[in-house]
Interface confidence: low
Amino acid sequence: EKPVYELQVQKSVTVQEGLCVLVPCSFSYPWRSWYSSPPLYVYWFRDGEIPYYAEVVATNNPDRRVKPETQGRFRLLGDVQKKNCSLSIGDARMEDTGSYFFRVERGRDVKYSYQQNKLNLEVTALIEKPDIHFLEPLESGRPTRLSCSLPGSCEAGPPLTFSWTGNALSPLDPETTRSSELTLTPRPEDHGTNLTCQVKRQGAQVTTERTVQLNVSYAPQNLAISIFFRNGTGTALRILSNGMSVPIQEGQSLFLACTVDSNPPASLSWFREGKALNPSQTSMSGTLELPNIGAREGGEFTCRVQHPLGSQHLSFILSVQRSSSSCICVTEKQQGSWPLLT
C-alpha cells in the first residue's frame, strides 16, 4: 500500500505591500504507530532550498533556525496536530514574492516535502486605502469621534502610524492628529472641506491615505433678500434685516431672490401678507418673479426658511407708488446681474 501524503492549499495568493493575508492549509500523512509518539514538526520553506540545511520561513520546531527576514511575519496558525498548516503572512514585503513549499517530519518514518503543491505568493503595490469611520451626519458644534483603520492590516509586523490633516483640524494639538482616533467638533465653514487620514508602517516607506469630504449639517445663517429691478441696469437692493420698506413704481418688474447658507439646503418659501406664493419655483430656489406690479400688489413679503436645525424668516414691505415718472429710486444699491429662475 502506497503511503498517502496530501496537501490542500491554494496555488497562488496576492497581498498588497504592508498588509497581511491568511493562507488556509490542511495536510495528511501516514501514521500508524501506536507504540511511540514522536513530535510532529512542520515547515514552510522557500522553493529551491534544501530542507536539511536551509533556514525555514515558518515552523513549530523550536530547534530550527528561521530566516531573520520572515521572523515574526510568517507564522503557523492553527493546530498542526489537527493537520492544520495554515500560514499567516503579515506586513508583506515585495521581496516575499515567490514560491513556498510545505514539509512534514515525524520520527524516522515520516519525512516528506509536498513539492507538487507549491504556494505562489505575489506581493503587489499598496493600493488599499484606509477607512475613515464616523457617525453621520456631522453636525456643527457637536463633537464627533472619527476613527481610521487600514483593512487587511494585522498585528504582525511593525505598528501603523496615523496622521490626520484637514482645515477642520487646525485647532487640534499635533499629538491628537497622530492617533488612529480623534474627536472633531465641526464648524459650518468645515462643510465641504477635505479630511485626510494617512497611514504608514513604522520603519517602512509604504504610505497610503484616504480623503473624505466633510458633510457638516448647520443651521441657516446669513439670510438675505436681494431685489433685482428689470430695468436694464441690473440694479440690486439687498435686505438683511426685517421691516425695511422698498418703494417701487407701478408697472415695474422685479425678481426677489431669497438666499441663505445652510446644510442640508433649507426649504425656502415666499409669503405675501401671510399667504404662500409660487409653490414650485420658491420651494426649490427661493426666487420669485413679480412681473408688471399693480398698485394693489404691494405689501409685506416674507421669505421663510425651514430647516431641521432651525427656522428663520425675513420680511420687507413693498410699497407700490403710482406711476408718475420713469425713474426707479432706491436708497441702497449695488451692481449685479439679473438672475434667472432656477
Epitope: 404662500a276 406664493l277 409660487n278 419655483q281 426649490m284 420669485l288 425651514q306 434667472l340 429662475l341 432656477t342
Partner: antibody, heavy 118, light 107 residues
Framework: EIQLQQSGPELVKPGASVKVSCKAS????????MYWVKQSHGKSLEWIGY????????TYNQKFKGKATLTVDKSSSTAFMHLNSLTSEDSAVFYC???????????WGQGTLVTVSA | DIVMIQSQKFMSTSVGDRVSVTCKAS??????VAWYQQKPGQSPKALIY???YRYSGVPDRFTGSGSGTDFTLTISNVQSEDLAEYFC?????????FGSGTKLEIK
C-alpha cells in the same frame, strides 16, 4: 399666449432610441426650468427631471439617470428629451411642463406618446 | 424618495354631492403639495398649490386642505365635468413625486 408644443407620436423598436421635442412660445424660454414627466398607460405620473434652459444645467430623478438625457436649443426655444435603449417599459406619454410667473402656474405640453414595439 | 399614497383608486359620486379625495405622504412635506385634474386624453391641469390655494380660474368648489403628511382635495357640488382622475404631488424635495391617482366616476 403661452404654449408648449410637443412633437408627434413615435413608434420605435426595442433597443432603439427616440428624441422628443417641446417648443415653447409666448414667454421668455430661458427664465424657467423645463420639467419632463412620464405617464405610463393607465398609470400615475413620474417626474423624470428638469433642465435650466439658461445654462443647460440638469437635475434627474435617479430612476431615469442613464435612460433620459435633457437638452435645449435656446435659439429655437425648444427643449428635448432623448430616451435610449428603449424597452416596452418605456412605452408611455411624455409631457414637458414649466411653472410660470408670480404664482408658479404650471403649463403642460399636450404630451407625446412613445410606443416601443417589435 | 417621498411616496404619495392615494389609497382610493376609484370614487363614485353623484352630481351635486360633495366628495373628498385623500393623499398621504410617507414623510412630512409641510404644505408643499399640489393637486391636478386629468381628463381622458388630456394633459394634467393644476387645481391647487401649497395644499390649500386655488390657481386662478379654478372653480371655488375645489378646496384643498392638510399639512405635514395628510392632504385632502374636496369637491363640493360635484358637476358632470368633474369626471376625471385626480393626482396629488409633493414638491417639498427632489425627486418630485405624484400619487397614484383617484378616478372620480359620476353615477
Amino acid at each position: 399666449e403661452i404654449q408648449l408644443q410637443q412633437s408627434g407620436p413615435e413608434l420605435v423598436k426595442p433597443g432603439a432610441s427616440v428624441k422628443v421635442s417641446c417648443k415653447a412660445s409666448g414667454y421668455s424660454f430661458t427664465d424657467y426650468n423645463m420639467y419632463w414627466v412620464k405617464q405610463s398607460h393607465g398609470k400615475s405620473l413620474e417626474w423624470i427631471g428638469y433642465i435650466d434652459p439658461y445654462n443647460g444645467g440638469t437635475t434627474y430623478n435617479q430612476k431615469f439617470k442613464g435612460k433620459a438625457t435633457l437638452t435645449v436649443d435656446k435659439s429655437s426655444s425648444t427643449a428635448f428629451m432623448h430616451l435610449n435603449s428603449l424597452t416596452s417599459e418605456d412605452s408611455a406619454v411624455f409631457y414637458c411642463a414649466f411653472y410660470y410667473g408670480y404664482y408658479g402656474v404650471p403649463y403642460w405640453g399636450q404630451g407625446t406618446l412613445v410606443t416601443v414595439s417589435a | 424618495d417621498i411616496v404619495m399614497i392615494q389609497s382610493q383608486k376609484f370614487m363614485s359620486t353623484s352630481v351635486g354631492d360633495r366628495v373628498s379625495v385623500t393623499c398621504k405622504a410617507s414623510q412630512n412635506v409641510d404644505t408643499n403639495v399640489a393637486w391636478y385634474q386629468q381628463k381622458p386624453g388630456q394633459s394634467p391641469k393644476a387645481l391647487i398649490y401649497s395644499a390649500s390655494y386655488r390657481y386662478s380660474g379654478v372653480p371655488d368648489r375645489f378646496t384643498g386642505s392638510g399639512s405635514g403628511t395628510d392632504f385632502t382635495l374636496t369637491i363640493s357640488n360635484v358637476q358632470s365635468e368633474d369626471l376625471a382622475e385626480y393626482f396629488c404631488q409633493q414638491y417639498n424635495s427632489f425627486p418630485l413625486t405624484f400619487g397614484s391617482g383617484t378616478k372620480l366616476e359620476i353615477k
